[in-house]
C-alpha cells in the first residue's frame, strides 16, 4: 500500500522537517527558518510559535517540532500548552480585574494563584479553633472540649474548605 501510495502521491515521501514543494515539481524542500513540520507528507510548514512578552521560550522551535513557551517570572501558565499567562499574586491575595487584592476577612489563599477561600468552620465538625486563620493560612481546628478528657486523641486535621462559587464581575 505504501508503495502504491507513493506512486500516486510523491508528497508522501517527504519526511518531517520538510514540505512538498509544488513550485519545484513536488520535491521535498526543507522547512524555511522559523517554521516546522512535525509529520511527513506535509504540503506546507507551520509557523513556529513565538514566545515573547509575557511568554518565554521553554523549548526552541526545530524543523520538526514547534517551540514551547512558559511564562516570564511574575506570571504563571494557564491552559493547554501554556496558551495564556496570568499574573502571580502574593499569598493572602487573589487576582481580580483590578489586580491583586488582599483576601477579605474570613478567607485565605496560601498560594500565588487562585482565589481566596473561606476559613474552615471548625464548629461544623464539633471542634474548636486551635489556631486562628490569617489571610495566608486556614484556621487549625482542635479537639472539642469533650475530646480533652484523659486518653483522648490528639489534634485532628482541619476539614477541607469548600470551594465557593465565583461571583460574576
Amino acid at each position: 500500500f505504501e508503495r502504491t501510495r507513493s506512486l500516486q502521491d510523491p508528497c508522501s515521501n517527504c519526511p518531517a522537517g520538510t514540505f512538498c514543494d509544488n513550485n519545484r515539481n513536488q520535491i521535498c524542500s526543507p522547512c524555511p527558518p522559523n517554521s516546522f513540520s512535525s509529520a511527513g507528507g506535509q504540503r506546507t510548514c507551520d509557523i513556529c510559535r513565538q514566545c515573547k512578552g509575557v511568554f518565554r521560550t521553554r523549548k526552541e522551535c526545530s524543523s520538526t517540532s514547534n517551540a514551547e513557551c512558559d511564562c516570564t517570572p511574575g506570571f504563571h501558565c494557564l491552559g493547554a500548552g501554556c496558551s495564556m499567562c496570568e499574573q502571580d499574586c502574593k499569598q493572602g491575595q487573589e487576582l481580580t480585574k483590578k489586580g491583586c487584592k488582599d483576601c477579605c476577612f474570613g478567607t485565605f489563599n496560601d498560594q500565588k494563584r487562585g482565589i481566596c477561600r473561606p476559613w474552615t468552620n471548625c464548629s461544623l465538625d464539633g471542634k474548636s479553633v486551635l489556631v486562628n486563620g490569617t489571610k495566608e493560612r486556614d484556621v487549625v481546628c482542635g479537639p472539642s472540649p469533650a475530646d480533652l478528657s484523659p486518653g483522648a486523641s490528639s489534634v485532628t486535621p482541619p476539614a477541607p474548605a469548600r470551594e465557593p462559587g465565583h461571583s460574576p464581575q
Partner: nanobody
Framework: QVQLVESGGGLVQPGGSLRLSCAAT?????NYWMNWVRQAPGKGLEW???????????YYVDSVKGRFTISRDNAKNSLFLQMNSLRAEDTAVYYC????????????????SGQGTTVTVSS
C-alpha cells in the same frame, strides 16, 4: 497573523512624560480587554494597567495610579499608555498584552503580547 507592536519608548528625565502606543493586527481589538505589563532590569514581570473593551473600566497597579493613563482607539486598533511624572523606578521594558473577551471569574490570562518598548528614566 495576530500581532501586537509597541512603540514610543525612549530616554526621559525624571518628571518627564512619554506616550506608548500598541498597534494590533490580525484581530479585532474591540473584542478584548487589553493590558500593559512591564519588566524592570533584573526583575519579574509586573502588571501595570488594563482597560475593558469600550474603555469604560480602567485599573492600575498602585505605584502608577494618578501618573499613568491607559486608553484605546478601537477604530484604529490601537492601545496607549500616557506616562507622566516618570520616576527612575519606571525604567523597564513595557509590553502590551491581550486579555480575555470578558473578565469574569475564570481567569485573567493574557494570550498575546508584543516585543516590548524600552523606557529609561534617568537624568
Amino acid at each position: 497573523q495576530v500581532q501586537l507592536v509597541e512603540s514610543g519608548g525612549g530616554l526621559v528625565q525624571p518628571g518627564g512624560s512619554l506616550r506608548l502606543s500598541c498597534a494590533a493586527t490580525g484581530f479585532t481589538l474591540s473584542n478584548y480587554w487589553m493590558n500593559w505589563v512591564r519588566q524592570a532590569p533584573g526583575k519579574g514581570l509586573e502588571w501595570v494597567a488594563n482597560i475593558n473593551q469600550d474603555g469604560s473600566e480602567k485599573y492600575y497597579v498602585d505605584s502608577v495610579k494618578g501618573r499613568f493613563t491607559i486608553s484605546r482607539d478601537n477604530a484604529k486598533n490601537s492601545l496607549f499608555l500616557q506616562m507622566n511624572s516618570l520616576r527612575a523606578e519606571d525604567t523597564a521594558v513595557y509590553y502590551c498584552a491581550r486579555g480575555g473577551t470578558g473578565y469574569g471569574s475564570d481567569h485573567y490570562g493574557m494570550d498575546v503580547s508584543g516585543q516590548g518598548t524600552t523606557v529609561t528614566v534617568s537624568s
